[in-house]
Amino acid sequence: GILNLNKMVKQVTGKMPILSYWPYGCHCGLGGRGQPKDATDWCCQTHDCCYDHLKTQGCSIYKDYYRYNFSQGNIHCSDKGSWCEQQLCACDKEVAFCLKRNLDTYQKRLRFYWRPHCRGQTPGC
């Protein structure tokens, strides 16, 4: 769920998600439209696709709570719980490390980006 994702992103990137990523660009945070603005924004667009796939599979992406371990900079998704919980953790782990990989191109100007400026074709999943 959202609490899992926030905690994981903070642990992996060292940034407070509420201040740094939700929202950011055209796809980080709730919703998403248009062409991603940079690599960080692409991480979020890919994550949206991951969630969309789980939604089509009947998973409660915002409610399901999963267990994971954070140790020595790595995330280990617990193999306990339901199929949805395990898949949700995998989606969140991927976006957390994607955001970390792209910290060097993070642009402060894209925080709280005005969504009406998000134009162009929204990438498909």
Partner: antibody
Amino acid sequence: QVTLKESGPGILQSSQTLSLTCSLSGFSLSTSGMGVSWIRQPSGKGLEWLAHIYWDDDKRYNPSLKSRLTISKDTSRNQVFLKITSVDTADTATYYCARRESRYFYFDYWGQGATLTVSS
Amino acid sequence: QIVLTQSPAIMSASPGEKVTISCSASSSVSYMYWYQQKPGSSPKPWIFRTSNLASGVPARFSGSGSGTSYSLTISSMEAEDAATYYCQQYHSYPPTFGSGTKLEIK
């Protein structure tokens, strides 16, 4: 050879507490990924999952019964326990323990069941 | 929680007849699992991950489906197949079972 064997009181009065034991052999509950569930079946009816305990003592409960259930284990004796408080006639059923490995999403080995009758 | 509805509740089939048991989920699931239970015995895993037969299950059994609709099929009914069959999901928590289909031999 993997086996699970349930034991319990057989008969209880309404409002008493049910204590069940599942004795395991052929595998160790301390092995990473192992877990045991309790599942019950009223006579002639379907199956209802109650609770699950993992190798690391993490526990899960059926939300509809959570307030009445306690699952626990004794790794040294390779046993799993279930307590159900304030039983009534609706709890009359056969109680099974079953193994689930975390990477799988089904129960691969089941005990033969322990029958409970609750009298009012 | 996900509710699994099995149909029919009871059915009878003649030896050699094709049998199909259905399991409908209240919301989409990734896989379905099936158990066979005979009177006085505990359930036995029968089909896992929708279509994979458990060890020792005869090849006349098969499983299929996706989303909210799954089925177990016996290509040619035999006397030893008379039993109650349950579907089960652990797609989302808590794991749930269908109400069962009692299959009798004519």
